[in-house]
């Protein structure tokens, strides 16, 4: 197999391919561009089987800075090449090119989630969507942390089958009247850097002095 | 046609760094993943990682603990990969290979590249 | 990580003679694209590897037909109809499948 298309690729543009709540987002941003397009069309081809480029069908003509690939792009081992043409009306400003390899260049952001804090304990509620895909599962584990007083802890939980529906983790043994933060991610099995997310605090309420004469046996 | 030329071998200290360069001639560098594969004296072959030249991204086996670090230069078509705080363990042939699809392993190699760390 | 067992360690073929190499992993390699990413190389002295099959069957241009893998999920074999001298070195199986990508232990033919 021989994939020597032209090696086209333009610097104008900087694309990043990010799994966000488990759908494929491509996003890109323009370099030096003196004037800005009015929109935008996302056309691709897997290297490997050589045909015509295709437009993305929900990402032509369109004025976002980013498209959804998950309905497209679905091995994670192909090369895809992909073209951005940029417009102004109906003149061609640029058009830039990428390939991209799903199992090397996506990253993985972290999911939606909430904390509710009990006197001794925090549940944590993570959001994934009710279907994922197979093929976007990538052996991701979930990692949630718990922070408290400078010290941190992680937990890995055992996920049964997919990572879809809503999930409830509860960190326990903690200490009442003590203010704990937590931040959840995807971790990948290799030396990736995770994107964690931003931390949600909570102050946990003053347990009884009977919970805590208890704790203290 | 197609060639990755490996700079040469390398006699080093323990708890040196070394840079193993992969320059790539013959196709479209940003078209091909650049693998690396290393084989220890007399053993068999041990997947190390892989980048996209074009992206500059790359993933490494967790297995290597943090000791290699890939990089690509698009303006000279090179792949290089930088090896921290080696041992003994680390002498090995090291070698870099193309792929056009991940995981279909590579359709040429490189001439490897010998390392000794020794004091 | 995914351990691929091959066997023999050794094969000792005459010229002529047909030769079989088996690969077992620890798990499916079948992928969620529905293709199964397993390779054969060869290794022969003094050089780099070569690859010869990916994707279980498929012949790498340049390889003779003499050579043809088959396999699913997690048992894979390499068969070589007619050694001849070339063919002497070690075959490794590659999966691709699951990260990181695994090797087997090397299969080494000599030349009876």
């Known amino acids: 197999i021989s994939y020597d298309s032209p090696d086209y690729t333009d610097e104008s543009c900087t694309f990043k391919i990010s799994l966000r709540n488990f759908r494929s987002i491509l996003s890109w941003e323009l370099k030096n561009h003196s004037i800005v397009p009015t929109h935008y069309t996302l056309l691709y081809t897997i290297m490997s089987k050589p045909e015509d480029l295709k437009v993305v069908k929900n990402c032509a003509n369109t004025t976002r800075s980013f498209c959804d690939l998950t309905d497209e792009w679905r091995s994670t081992h192909e090369a895809y090449v992909t073209v951005l043409e940029g417009f102004s009306g109906n003149t061609t400003l640029f058009s830039c090119s990428h390939n991209f390899w799903l199992a090397i260049d996506m990253s993985f952001e972290p999911p939606e989630f909430e904390i509710v804090g009990f006197t001794n304990h925090i549940n944590v509620m993570v959001k994934f969507p009710s279907i994922v895909e197979e093929e976007l599962q990538f052996d991701l584990s979930l990692v949630i942390e718990e922070q408290s007083e400078g010290i941190v802890k992680k937990h890995k939980p055992e996920i049964k089958g997919n990572m879809s529906g809503n999930f409830t983790y509860i960190i326990d043994k903690l200490i009442p009247n003590t203010n704990y933060c937590v931040s959840v991610y995807l971790e990948h099995s290799d030396e990736q850097a995770v994107i964690k997310s931003p931390l949600k605090c909570t102050l946990l309420p003053p347990g009884q002095e009977s919970e805590s004469a208890e704790s203290a046996k | 046609q197609v060639q990755l030329q490996q700079s040469g071998g390398e006699l080093v200290r323990p708890g040196t760094s070394v840079k193993v360069s992969c320059k790539a001639s013959?196709?479209?560098?940003?078209?091909?993943?650049i693998e690396w594969i290393r084989q220890r004296p007399g053993q068999g072959l041990e997947w190390i990682g892989v980048?996209?030249?074009?992206?500059?991204?790359?993933k490494s086996s967790k297995n290597l603990k943090g000791k290699a670090t890939l990089t690509a230069d698009k303006s000279s078509n090179t792949a290089y990969m930088q090896l921290s705080s080696l041992t003994s363990d680390d002498s090995a042939v090291y070698f870099c290979?193309?792929?056009?699809?991940?995981?279909?392993?590579?359709?040429?190699w490189g001439q490897g590249t010998t390392l000794t760390v020794s004091s | 990580d995914v351990v691929m067992t091959q066997t023999p360690l050794t094969l000792s073929v005459t010229i002529g003679q047909p030769a079989s190499i088996s690969c077992k992993s620890s798990?499916?390699?079948?992928?969620?694209?529905?293709?199964?990413?397993l390779n054969w190389l060869l290794q022969r002295p003094g050089q780099s590897p070569k690859r010869l099959i990916y994707?279980?069957?498929k012949l790498d241009s340049g390889v003779p037909d003499r050579f043809t893998g088959s396999g699913s999920g997690t048992d894979f074999t390499l068969k070589i109809s007619r050694v001849e001298a070339e063919d002497l070195g070690v075959y490794y199986c590659?999966?691709?499948?699951?990260?990181?990508?695994?090797f087997g232990g090397g299969t080494k033919l000599e030349i009876k």
């Open positions: 290979a193309r792929s056009g699809v991940y995981g279909s392993s590579p359709d040429y």
């Open positions: 013959g196709y479209a560098f940003t078209n091909y993943l």
């Open positions: 980048i996209n030249p074009g992206s500059g991204n790359s």
């Open positions: 798990q499916s390699l079948l992928d969620s694209d529905g293709k199964t990413y």
């Open positions: 994707l279980v069957s």
């Open positions: 590659w999966q691709g499948t699951h990260f990181p990508q695994t």
